[in-house]
């Protein structure tokens, strides 16, 4: 009976050790979570579901690239000394989804694409690259597609509401759709310099029959095929004495 | 019996240690969570469900790129010393989804796409790259698509409400839709410099039959295919004495 | 400049770096697109005498103040950043570097 | 400049870096798109004498102030950032760097 008692105590001790370990681990994780939010300048964790993420996450090469770009752990020749490390996260790439704008309305009241909202934190001279990515739906027969990116402007005397940003001609073959990126660095920089000039853009990708192949408002099965802006920024941290 | 008692005490100690470890782990994690929110300048974790994320997350290359771009852990030639560490996160890429705007309304009162709201924290001169991403729905036959991105402007005397940002011609083949990105860096920089000029954009991607292929408001199964802005910014954190 | 690396099975009582994986999926942070988890690690252990101390003169201070002194604390002496891809809750997906997210080395301080 | 690395099985009692993985999904932070988890690590252990201290002169202070002194604490002496992709709750997905999110080194201070 005595040895049984001892065995029970031993098991209980193991249990306590385990529980203690789990508890401290939990505390560490919680502290890290708080730290992450703080470093990302987030007051709370964004409330977004897995399903919402799946629907939102662009199914485009840049996203796959970012996800693949690092292993579960990566050591990029950093000596990681505490002295030269900043606290807050530094942004390298911003993928911006279009938001609705009162300016971009169709005659039937439906919203048009696309208006991209930008944080004033983004400095125009720090923009290294700005690409507008659009997904062109599949075609059934070989076709030439005319892609036109227009910038919404304040109506001019002649009624002009748009000014062209970029136009390109693509040859598409039957099969799956394709992603196309358009350099919009200058446009973005101007928007950042003069935010009031950012009234939105219009995306057209017309095939030879005038069908618009650009996914601007995803239809069934088109989750993650929204246009989006991929902006790469450069960061030059200033060092400070503590 | 004495040795049995000692064994029991030892076991109990292990149990307690385990429980303690679990508890401190929990505390650490909680602290990290708080820190993350703080560093991201978030008061609370964003209230977004997995489903919402799935719907919102652009299924576009930049997202795939961002997700793939780094390992779960990356050490990018930072010497990471404690002394020079800033607290808040620095943003590198901002993916902005369109929001509704009173300006972008159709005749029937429905919102039009797209208006992108930007934080005043983004400095126009820090924008390295800004891409508007749009998804073009699949076409059934090879077609030429004319993509036009227009910027909404204050109505001019002649009634002009838009100015072109970019126009491009794409050739689309049958199959899946495609993402197209448009460089809107200049536009974005202008918006950031003059936020009042950001009235929204209109995206048109007309095929040869005049059908708009751009997904601006995702329909069924088109989650994640909304247009969005991907902005890459460079951050120059100011160092401060602590 | 070195530090001890331990794991949960280690018998090392001194200040040591232990593995700690932060699994974002495990606690529902779906807004973090990548990484889904990362090795944060942590420092734990005793700081006796001058073991693994970065600035040994701390020891003298403790000698001068024997009572109530908890001694030097086992803390990170080397940290490294991680890159993260995440939704920021503002229709944007951000890819950036978060400094001091991984404990590379632990020490007493 | 060095530190001990331990894990949950370590018997090391001194200030040590322990692995700690922060799993965002585990606690429902779906708004963090990436990473879903990361290794934050943490510092833990006793700070006795000058073991793993980053600023050894703390020891002298303690010697001079015997009463009420908790002694040096096992803390990170080196931190590194992580990159994160997250929804910021304002229709935006942000990719950025969060400094000092990973404990690279722990020490007593």
């Amino acid at each position: 009976e005595g040895s049984e008692r001892e065995e029970n105590v031993e098991k209980e001790g193991l249990c306590n050790a385990c529980a203690w370990r789990q508890n401290t681990r939990y505390s560490r994780i919680e502290a890290i979570k708080i730290q992450i939010l703080s470093k990302l300048r987030l007051e709370t964790a964004p409330n977004i579901s897995k399903d919402a993420i799946r629907q939102l996450l662009p199914r485009a090469p840049p996203l796959r690239e970012l996800i693949d770009q690092y292993d579960v752990q990566r050591d990029d020749s950093s000596d990681g000394s505490l002295e030269d490390d900043d606290y807050h996260a530094t942004t390298e790439t911003i993928i911006t989804m279009p938001t609705e704008s009162d300016f971009l309305m169709q005659a039937d009241g439906k919203p048009k694409c696309c208006f991209f909202k930008f944080s004033s934190k983004i400095q125009y001279n720090k923009v290294v690259k700005a690409q507008l990515w659009i997904y062109l739906r599949p075609v059934k027969t070989p076709t030439t597609v005319f892609v036109q990116i227009l910038r919404l402007i304040k109506p001019m005397k002649d009624g002009t509401r748009y000014t062209g940003i970029r136009s390109l001609k693509l040859d598409m073959s039957p099969g799956t759709g394709i992603w196309q990126s358009i350099d919009v660095k200058t446009v973005l920089q101007n928007w950042l310099k003069q935010p009031e000039s950012n009234l939105g853009i219009e995306i057209k990708a017309l095939d030879e029959n005038g069908h618009d192949l650009a996914v601007t408002f995803p239809g069934p099965g088109e989750d993650g095929l929204n246009p989006f802006l991929e902006v790469k920024v450069t960061d030059t941290p200033k060092r400070s004495r503590r | 019996e004495g040795s049995e008692r000692e064994e029991n005490v030892e076991k109990e100690g292990l149990c307690n240690a385990c429980a303690w470890r679990q508890n401190t782990r929990y505390s650490r994690i909680e602290a990290i969570k708080i820190q993350i929110l703080s560093k991201l300048r978030l008061e609370t974790a964003p209230n977004i469900s997995k489903d919402a994320i799935r719907q919102l997350l652009p299924r576009a290359p930049p997202l795939r790129e961002l997700i793939d771009q780094y390992d779960v852990q990356r050490d990018d030639s930072s010497d990471g010393s404690l002394e020079d560490d800033d607290y808040h996160a620095t943003t590198e890429t901002i993916i902005t989804m369109p929001t509704e705007s009173d300006f972008l309304m159709q005749a029937d009162g429905k919102p039009k796409c797209c208006f992108f709201k930007f934080s005043s924290k983004i400095q126009y001169n820090k924008v390295v790259k800004a891409q508007l991403w749009i998804y073009l729905r699949p076409v059934k036959t090879p077609t030429t698509v004319f993509v036009q991105i227009l910027r909404l402007i204050k109505p001019m005397k002649d009634g002009t409400r838009y100015t072109g940002i970019r126009s491009l011609k794409l050739d689309m083949s049958p199959g899946t839709g495609i993402w197209q990105s448009i460089d809107v860096k200049t536009v974005l920089q202008n918006w950031l410099k003059q936020p009042e000029s950001n009235l929204g954009i209109e995206i048109k991607a007309l095929d040869e039959n005049g059908h708009d292929l751009a997904v601006t408001f995702p329909g069924p199964g088109e989650d994640g295919l909304n247009p969005f802005l991907e902005v890459k910014v460079t951050d120059t954190p100011k160092r401060s004495r602590r | 400049d070195f530090g001890l690396d331990c794991d949960e099975h280690s018998t090392e009582s001194r200040c040591c770096r232990y593995p700690l994986t932060v699994d974002f999926e495990a606690f529902g942070w779906d807004w973090i697109i990548a990484p889904k988890r990362y090795k944060a690690n942590y420092c734990s252990g005793e700081c006796e005498f001058v073991f693994l101390q970065k600035y040994p003169h701390t020891h003298l201070v403790h000698q001068a103040n024997p009572r109530g002194s908890a001694g030097p604390c086992c803390t990170p002496t080397k940290m490294s950043p991680i890159n993260m891809l995440y939704f920021n809750g503002k229709e944007q997906i951000i890819y950036g570097k978060i400094p001091a997210m991984v404990v590379d080395r632990c020490g007493c301080s | 400049d060095f530190g001990l690395d331990c894990d949950e099985h370590s018997t090391e009692s001194r200030c040590c870096r322990y692995p700690l993985t922060v799993d965002f999904e585990a606690f429902g932070w779906d708004w963090i798109i990436a990473p879903k988890r990361y290794k934050a690590n943490y510092c833990s252990g006793e700070c006795e004498f000058v073991f793993l201290q980053k600023y050894p002169h703390t020891h002298l202070v303690h010697q001079a102030n015997p009463r009420g002194s908790a002694g040096p604490c096992c803390t990170p002496t080196k931190m590194s950032p992580i990159n994160m992709l997250y929804f910021n709750g304002k229709e935006q997905i942000i990719y950025g760097k969060i400094p000092a999110m990973v404990v690279d080194r722990c020490g007593c201070s």
Epitope: K50, P61, P62, G224 | R59, P61, Q69 | P35 | -
Partner: antibody, heavy 119, light 110 residues
């Protein structure tokens, strides 16, 4: 017409270096990821590596140190180079559009080229 | 290393029967849905059938369907046709530049 076509030597000696070219038509390599997959005779598919639209390279763990992937967008070509070839590397090598497992990657493949490693 | 296990190794069914192919990953695929199914016939390159675990690829007959999430996935052929005789492979993506194929399931038509 969108096509991918692999080309390169049919026979390679052990320890030698294999160089395969994937020539694409109707594909913009600046917007498209290209993957390499191989298949040993009578065996299953094996992922080799990727060159992303942006030029980043990702390789299977077994291929690290041996594999180089590059591209010349102006020539519409992706080149795979594998050093220190061994008879176990005998396989049909395919290039594919996109990344199999990501979105609709792998929707288009080349016909493959059989490479035999033998002395 | 990641291991993707497909079962059964061979499936022999009659035309019109329902075929159920399984794919199990040693780790959860990225975002629980980075999984595709491919069909390969002798002497031909693989053909994409399903992506995002359950999305039917362009031009693929509706008798093919995919389901599952995380580590366990299923490809179903609701009513086998003679032309469905082939080897089927699952492919998973894990982030960090890690991808893998299953060893394949051979479907034979009796």
């Amino acid at each position: 017409q969108v096509t991918l076509k692999e080309s390169g030597p049919v026979l390679v000696k052990p320890t030698e270096t294999l160089t395969l070219t994937c020539t694409v038509s109707g594909i913009d390599l600046s917007h498209t990821d290209i993957s390499w997959v191989r298949q040993a005779p009578g065996k299953g598919l094996e992922w080799v590596g990727i060159i992303s639209y942006a030029g980043s390279k990702y390789k299977a763990s077994w291929a690290k140190g041996r594999l180089t992937i590059s591209k010349d967008t102006s020539k519409n070509q992706v080149v795979l180079t594998m050093t220190n070839m061994d008879p176990v590397d005998t396989a049909t090598y395919y290039c594919a559009r996109g990344v199999p497992a990501y979105s609709h990657g792998g929707d288009l493949w080349g016909q493959g080229t059989l490479v035999t490693v033998s002395s | 290393d990641i291991v993707m296990t497909q079962s059964p190794a061979t499936l022999s069914l009659s035309p019109g029967e329902r075929a159920t192919l399984s794919c199990t990953s040693s780790q959860s695929v990225y975002h629980a849905n980075w999984l595709s199914w491919f069909q390969q016939k002798p002497g031909q390159p693989p053909k994409l059938l399903i992506y995002w675990a359950s999305t039917l690829a362009y031009g693929v007959p509706s008798r093919f369907s995919g389901s599952g999430s995380g580590t366990d996935f299923t490809l179903t052929i609701s009513s086998l046709q003679p032309e469905d005789a082939a080897t089927y492979y699952c492919a998973g993506g894990y982030g960090g530049g890690r991808y893998a194929f299953g060893q394949g399931t051979k479907v034979e038509i009796k």
